[in-house]
Interface confidence: low
Amino acid sequence: VPRWRQQWSGSGTTSRFPETVLARCVKYTEVHPEMRHVDCQSVWDAFKGAFISKYPCNITEEDYQPLVKLGTQTVPCNKTLLWSRIKDLAHQFTQVQRDMFTLEDMLLGYLADDLTWCGEFNTFEINYQSCPDWRKDCSNNPVSVFWKTVSRRFAETACGVVHVMLNGSRSKIFDKNSTFGSVEVHNLQPEKVQALEAWVIHGGREDSRDLCQDPTIKELESIISKRNIRFFCKNIYRPDKFLQCVKNPEDSSCLSGIHHHHHH
């Protein structure tokens, strides 16, 4: 007799979730020598322990602490790239600019990127049918709490000049309700972080406005300045050109006399 199962509004756990997490962990630790010591079976156990047998609307950051401990990793100062609503370009950028890192370039972010998961109270099963939706069901669900936890930690450990890529095509270029706006901004440590530099990515070819003057960017500047962190903003007018220039900094259409990639 099939058991009754809670119906949530969100899509269910990604198929082959345990295998995917384990395979990603193995791949990551093979490619990143500094993480070779990580035991992927222990990582999976800690991940599983955070949500299996637990009511999926009552997950806490505490549940993820064993996993966070196992995935401890540091980013060199000046090399942290945060992003909001522009994940693909941020990832394309760090794939080329290999010495900069988004959260998804770190072990825990890499494991969970684009995946969904949840369990059920009092059973050892994974729910592949449905998982809680952040808006329609609850915010304390396994996926949302995971990203909040690791995003907080990622921001807390950042140092030097931190960069953030923002989507200039959105009505709110800086959104206080995004993970960046609600978690990361407030967890940058003023004693370690000298400045936050926002890169506002323009959408249209003809868009030559200075989006650094956008009211939401001014709001971000105010929040950051109040935290005693300096704020800078740059327009990236042509994202296609931007990536091309990151790949080929010596290209004549990118360079006009400055023979280094960026000023800090």
């Epitope: 030559s208 007018y237 220039c245 990118c254 006009s256 990639h261 000023h263």
Partner: antibody, heavy 123, light 107 residues
């Protein structure tokens, strides 16, 4: 060697407009920024705005917003700065300058300057 | 906007002597700072960019140093053609801003 050649001196009445040109001879400027700076008699240098011809992206200093328009014609390697609603305080030498830099980050220093155009505003 | 403050306003130096000019930014401009020389009736001339890199054709007696908020232009042995007004300019944040200038005059 690139040179920036500016149009000649102008005398204008208050309330009118002036349009100063800046032509790059001996090379193109499309990969560069063109900045406009002014210097009132006996005073220091003041940024007015800049254009990145390749991107048709122009930005103005707040003080001049709404009064200044900077344009560029890539086909003739010429940049233009038009200042409207002239007043006596706008009497100054106006310079164009070529900006070198990684344009994606809009950070430029200026290595080549025009000879300057004196604009006198007087009734 | 970032305010650039130069000191002193006037520097009286004898030919052959060393001149040290200061420039302070109201907030960090990283190394995005340039120095220009201007003689009466002439356009400014780029001397230093990136806080410490000499522009093409600039003699070695001109050197720049500093980063963040404090910058220095040093002329190791003043020649007669070096008497002029010197401006610093930050290009880290728009609007770019100049200092008010330091006049180097013959003592």
């Amino acid at each position: 060697q690139v040179q920036l050649v500016q149009s000649g001196a102008e005398v204008k009445k208050p309330g009118s407009s002036v349009k100063v040109s800046c032509k790059a001879s001996g090379g193109s400027f499309s990969n560069y920024a063109i900045g406009w700076v002014r210097q009132a008699p006996g005073q220091g240098l003041e940024w007015m705005g800049r254009i990145i011809p390749r991107l048709d992206a122009e930005h103005y200093a707040q003080k001049f917003q709404g009064r200044v328009t900077i344009t560029a014609d890539e086909s003739t390697s010429t940049a233009y700065m038009e200042l409207s609603s002239l007043r006596s305080e706008d009497t100054a030498v106006y310079y164009c300058a070529r900006g070198l830099g990684y344009y994606l980050y809009s950070s430029y220093y200026f290595d080549i300057w025009g000879q300057g155009t004196l604009v006198t505003v007087s009734s | 906007e970032i305010v650039m403050t130069q000191s002193p306003a006037t520097l009286s130096v004898s030919p052959g002597e060393r001149a040290t000019l200061s420039c302070r930014a109201s907030q960090s401009v990283s190394s995005n700072l340039a120095w220009y020389q201007q003689k009466p009736g002439q356009a400014p001339r780029l001397l230093i960019y990136g806080a410490s890199t000499r522009a093409t054709g600039i003699p070695a007696r001109f050197s720049g140093s500093g980063s963040g908020t404090e910058f220095t232009l040093t002329i190791s042995s003043l020649q007669s053609e070096d008497f002029a007004v010197y401006y610093c300019q930050q290009y880290n944040n728009w609007p770019w801003t100049f200092g008010q200038g330091t006049k180097v005059e013959i003592k």
